[in-house]
Interface confidence: medium
Amino acid sequence: SERCDDWGLDTMRQIQVFEDEPARIKCPLFEHFLKFNYSTAHSAGLTLIWYWTRQDRDLEEPINFRLPENRISKEKDVLWFRPTLLNDTGNYTCMLRNTTYCSKVAFPLEVVQKDSCFNSPMKLPVHKLYIEYGIQRITCPNVDGYFPSSVKPTITWYMGCYKIQNFNNVIPEGMNLSFLIALISNNGNYTCVVTYPENGRTFHLTRTLTVKVVGSPKNAVPPVIHSPNDHVVYEKEPGEELLIPCTVYFSFLMDSRNEVWWTIDGKKPDDITIDVTINESISHSRTEDETRTQILSIKKVTSEDLKRSYVCHARSAKGEVAKAAKVKQKVPAPRYTVELACGFGAT
């Protein structure tokens, strides 16, 4: 058949939906691959065709739009399931074509099961709340377009397995859940169950997200260098190994890039001829403050190396800091017998 621009399997858009719930899936062509929208395509005489490949099969087959109660239907650029079944899992393809043009993309759809406490293999979005920051809200995600604005759904919120009612600092307000003052104890999975009627049937939408309480911008400080510091002197003899850790604390800052680097005599270690290695490790606190450690290592230090300046630098959105390590050569202990002998004129 004629050539078709095939965008392949778009694994970036791994779509997961719950079993026995409505799902509306937009054709990704118009969102991510083409420069025009569905309306433009439709008015230009292009047709959108859907087909699928079942899980563990190679055969592409058309989607059956003649199921009882219109269980699967298409509306403009949206594929509807009312509701999904477990065996709807597979790779779905939407193809836009006319006699002279063709473009298609496939994407994986996984129908997942949940238990009575909403546990499932679903990848959960993470919503970050600032600790002790005043009122903050989360909104029940991905429910737009399922019912018209004239329909008033009922929304029930859960934390883990428990319905949220009479909680100290968490208040359900329809599609929103308000945290009066977020604390570490508010970390967890929150689920909204949206129930709405349609054509004499009742449908449920379940949406779970993870709330992570993080450091507040009110408490954020520029990077703090714990080591090197004024309390520690790196006193070495030539031939010994020199190990200097640079340990830096970074306050949590949304979308901030935290950087730590060493300079030796004002240059990056890569730009000098010393045989130096640097190993980095990163750890996080409960509020996602970060501690980065970079260990500078010179296996066999020379007396020249011990005269150099070793400076640890750190940078975040809050500022840049630097601290020099105190490095010096060990003074050998005097050899008293020889010196005393010389003093007495011995030869």
Epitope: V221, V224, H226, S227, N229, H231, V232, V233, Y234, E235, L243, I244, P245, T247, Y249, S251, S281, D289, T291, T293, I295
Partner: antibody, heavy 123, light 112 residues
Framework: QVQLVQSGAEVKKPGASVKLSCKAS????????MNWVRQAPGQGLEWVGQ????????YYAQKFQGRATLTVDTSTSTAYMELSSLRSEDTAVYYC????????????????WGQGTLLTVSS | DIQLTQSPSSLSASVGDRATITCRAS??????????MHWYQQKPGKAPKLLIK???DLESGVPSRFSGSGSGTDFTLTISSVQPEDFATYYC??????????FGQGTKLEIK
Amino acid sequence: QVQLVQSGAEVKKPGASVKLSCKASGYIFITYWMNWVRQAPGQGLEWVGQIFPASGTTYYAQKFQGRATLTVDTSTSTAYMELSSLRSEDTAVYYCARTDFYRYDGGYALDYWGQGTLLTVSS
Amino acid sequence: DIQLTQSPSSLSASVGDRATITCRASQSVSTSGYSSMHWYQQKPGKAPKLLIKYASDLESGVPSRFSGSGSGTDFTLTISSVQPEDFATYYCHHSWGIPMYTFGQGTKLEIK
């Protein structure tokens, strides 16, 4: 996970010396101060001193200056405390304890402890 | 050197009671934003265990019935509802400045 495993009980005579060990695992040994704390039978906790393994920098409580020596072997992630000129009042359980890191320079808490080594000094 | 004085030296409580231990430093162990005061629990024959660091920061894994407060020279450890496993000795500890750390003399929490 972080673990500090200390050497076994010791019995020494007055005037002798003893060297206790503390093997660390589960974290980057050289980047945390290691402290030694002792506890005489039925008494409270008493800080002996601390060492920064990366550099060998040490600090001692005045009482132990000159009598306690803290060292480390970074290749085996082991800290040592040697106590010389032992006397009967040195009979105690000796703990090694790691300091945590905090956002501010200055005081650190002792977040992980070894199981303790009982030193008995008796003639 | 900074001295720490804990009170009371022993405390009797029943399961479910609220227990409060105080620790007074001979000079301030606080600066803007934090205090170098920590609390430990020790059971007979065991190593101390960190409960609260920097006056009020609950150590990971420690039950939320433990809380700490205070700044400057006066600090408090509170157990909101004493449980059977809480009967132990509690120590305050300051780490203000290098190189001297000191501990309070301890408070023994006993069953009433």
